[in-house]
């Protein structure tokens, strides 16, 4: 992927070309400024809490700090989903929620955060050193995952502080490349503005050099540098993850991937497919590792006026309060 940006000529402009050159000088900073403003790095936070009432009961809360539209959230334990982790719950904003034991209640707390309560009894109950991971699939940011666990010395009732610990994924390589381009653009914009401020008024004399202005090129990482970005998952071994759930979901991915609509999910690819998979353009981002967007351009439709069940800004917890007639 290559993007070319026209830069002003280094020599004074030719007579009659001053308007065109001035226009080009003005347009480029605005284009770059727009890119700078819209470029942001999303982050996932994970908070694990052991309930004081039930010592083996956990509440996991996860959130996505990004501007994109979340299309799927997967909560797993024992490591990242797809790398030995076992799926506990999957939350789809437009199709619903699916959970597996020992998950007791998965729910959306806000448009960008979820919570999951785990039961604390039986062979499948978690223990204090279990690692919990949350993966958020979002457009246009892609797939972001973070993991957290309860500190070994935690007292019951206390929670681990939210841990934004994103795991670099193969499907982020393209985004990182774009971020690099944008960063370069921002730096270049500052340089351009600074130079523009200090530049003396140009003399209107014909150019002695070629009329073709030199071009500055900004490009995405090469294949080699993209490959360098492909960091494998951090695999966490825990002593208390039940083997019974592993047989149910051997790869951490439930068996329903094929049943979801094409814009929601596909069965994940193995890490071997990473290096050979080209990084797509941001506009039609397709997740490399788990192919969550076949039609990434789709945005969730708006709900009709006055027909929402609970459009309460407090989220689903508003349900627990007194029910008013809408």
């Amino acid at each position: 992927m290559r993007t070319e940006a026209q830069v002003p000529a280094l020599q004074p402009p030719e007579p009659g070309l001053e308007g065109a050159m001035g226009h080009r000088t003005l347009v480029l900073p605005w284009v770059l400024l727009t890119l700078c403003v819209t470029a942001g790095t999303p982050e996932v936070w994970v908070q694990v809490r052991m309930e004081a009432t039930e010592l083996s009961s956990f509440t996991i809360r996860c959130g996505f700090l990004g501007s994109g539209s979340i299309s799927l959230v997967t909560v797993s334990w024992g490591g990242p989903n797809g790398a030995g982790g076992t799926t506990l719950a999957v939350l789809h904003p437009e199709r619903g929620i699916r959970q597996w034991a020992p998950a007791r209640q998965a729910r959306w707390e806000t448009q960008s955060s979820i919570s999951l309560i785990l039961e604390g009894s039986g062979a499948s109950s978690p223990c204090a050193n279990t690692t919990f991971c949350c993966k958020f699939a979002s457009f246009p940011e892609g797939s972001w995952e973070a993991c957290g666990s309860l500190p070994p010395s935690s007292d019951p009732g206390l929670s681990a502080p939210p841990t934004p610990a994103p795991i670099l994924r193969a499907d982020l390589a393209g985004i990182l490349g774009v971020s690099g381009v944008l960063l370069f653009g921002c730096v270049y914009l500052l340089h351009l503005l600074r130079r523009h401020k200090h530049r003396p008024a140009p003399r209107l004399q014909p150019s002695r050099t070629s009329p073709q202005a030199p071009r500055a090129r900004a490009w995405a990482p090469s294949q080699a540098s993209q490959a360098a970005l492909h960091v494998p998952y951090a695999t966490i071994n825990t002593s208390c993850r039940p083997a019974t759930l592993d047989t149910a979901h051997p790869h951490g991915g439930p068996s329903w991937w094929a049943s979801l609509p094409t814009h929601a999910a596909h069965r994940p690819q193995g890490p071997a497919a990473w290096a050979s998979t080209p990084i797509p353009a941001r506009g039609s981002f397709v997740s490399v590792e788990n192919g969550l967007y076949a039609q990434a351009g789709e945005r969730p439709p708006h709900t009709g006026p006055g027909l929402t069940l609970f459009p309460d800004p407090r989220g689903p917890r508003a349900m627990e309060g007194p029910l008013g007639v809408r």
Epitope: E94, S259, T308, L309, F310, M319
Partner: nanobody, 118 residues
């Protein structure tokens, strides 16, 4: 797209009973909130009762003690048992589903008519 299909409406005398049912096409995910709304002729649509997939239930005051909402054995099936029906319960009853509970995407059935008249 989640499809909701209601059934069970009809004509009943005051004090009688009816059972409305709603079946959702979504059979993999649990729909976080499902509920019943009604719209009487010439009036706005109003909430009757809701139930979350974890079993939390709410009723509007005017139907408390008379109506019972429940989720069936089949995934995402919903029913509304209506007892001690009154003339003011006459309306088109709509099944509603909010998969996330956030109102981001809400689905509606086509409605079933309930007429309470002697």
């Amino acid at each position: 797209e989640v499809q909701l299909v209601e059934s069970g409406g009809g004509l009943v005398q005051p004090g009688g009973s009816l059972r409305l049912s709603c079946a959702a096409s979504e059979t993999y995910f649990d729909l976080y909130v499902m509920g019943w709304y009604r719209q009487a002729p010439g009036k706005d649509r109003e909430l009757v009762a809701t139930i979350t997939y974890t079993g939390s239930i709410k009723y509007v005051d005017s139907v408390k003690g008379r109506f019972t909402i429940s989720r069936g054995d089949a995934k995402n099936s919903l029913s509304l048992q209506m007892n001690s029906l009154r003339a003011e319960d006459t309306a088109v009853y709509y099944c509603n589903a909010d998969p996330s509970g956030l109102g981001r995407k809400v689905y509606w059935g086509q409605g079933t008519m309930v007429t309470v008249s002697s």
